[in-house]
């Protein structure tokens, strides 16, 4: 009876459990009935970090000088490269594709703190009665407006992102 | 494509004024915060004050708080930075930055050298 599943770090092909590649190489040829499966390193500037059936190793990353990137951390067979920003910049995502001076805080949010050389910008969520309408990375949470030292009152209530809207008091009609 | 150009920069003595600009273009100037941010020989960048799209609101680092001024004329699509009672610490390469700024689009920057 030909297998239906295969165990950990096994494929199924042509009705039979082969060997997966372990992470650095990649896939020749499938096993036979004869033969065991047939891996080959990657390349300098490849990598494959699982065990796999891949024909192709992946290509690592490059750290663009030109984006403001350099090398973090040199690739391996198993690894990819890992790229950072130049001293004073910020990657802008986790994968760090790109880099920028420091990070804006969106509405909703305001500056903590300044970025500096070391630090990016750090944000925090404005509280109840603060908001900030902006993307910032300087500006801090403002507090709404107080409409009673304006002798008015609050016709549409303050968010995270926007001030309260202040109106004339209803007179009473006699 | 957004350029920055800085401009003004020059030796000054200590004590002495100058007024920086920063000529932008390949962006809508008018909807972005605005920086200006030095690096001195052999040091990091340090930011040294903001302004607000508007031009309502503004930051200033506390090494230059009450001898630096920033301003902006969204007509012009220019960025300022006054200078004054400028002292040997000041002496820096002076960029001009939008929000976000990606570093492919950073500026050539402008000399300010304060020395007697």
């Known amino acids: 009876e030909p297998p239906t599943a295969c165990r950990e770090k096994q494929y199924l092909i042509n009705s039979q459990c082969c060997s997966l590649c372990q992470p650095g190489q990649k896939l020749v040829s499938d096993c036979t009935e004869f033969t065991e499966t047939e891996c080959l390193p990657c390349g300098e500037s490849e990598f494959l970090d699982t065990w796999n059936r891949e024909t192709h190793c992946h290509q690592h990353k490059y750290c663009d000088p030109n984006l403001g990137l350099r090398v973090q951390q040199k690739g391996t067979s198993e690894t990819d490269t890992i790229c950072t920003c130049e001293e004073g910049w910020h990657c802008t995502s986790e994968a760090c594709e790109s880099c920028v001076l420091h990070r804006s805080c969106s509405p909703g949010f305001g500056v903590k703190q300044i970025a500096t050389g070391v630090s990016d910008t750090i944000c925090e969520p404005c509280p109840v009665g603060f908001f900030s309408n902006v993307s910032s990375a300087f500006e801090k949470c403002h507090p709404w407006t107080s409409c009673e030292t304006k002798d008015l009152v609050v016709q549409q209530a303050g968010t995270n992102k926007t001030d309260v809207v202040c109106g004339p008091q209803d007179r009473l009609r006699a | 494509e957004v350029q920055l150009l800085e401009s003004g920069g020059g030796l000054v003595q200590p004590g002495g004024s100058l007024r920086l600009s920063c000529a932008a273009s390949?962006?809508?100037?008018?909807?972005?915060e605005m920086w200006w941010v030095r690096q001195a020989p052999g040091k990091g960048l340090e930011r040294v004050s903001?302004?607000?799209?508007?031009?309502?609101?503004?930051y200033y680092a506390d090494s230059v708080k009450g001898r630096f001024t920033i301003s902006r004329d969204n007509s012009k699509n220019t960025l300022y930075l006054q200078m004054n009672s400028l002292r040997a610490e000041d002496t820096a390469v002076y960029y001009c930055?939008?929000?976000?700024?990606?570093?492919?689009?950073w500026g050539q920057g402008t000399l300010v050298t304060v020395s007697s």
């Open positions: 930055a939008k929000l976000p700024q990606l570093f492919q689009d």
């Open positions: 390949g962006f809508t100037f008018r909807d972005y």
């Open positions: 903001a302004i607000n799209p508007q031009g309502t609101r503004t």
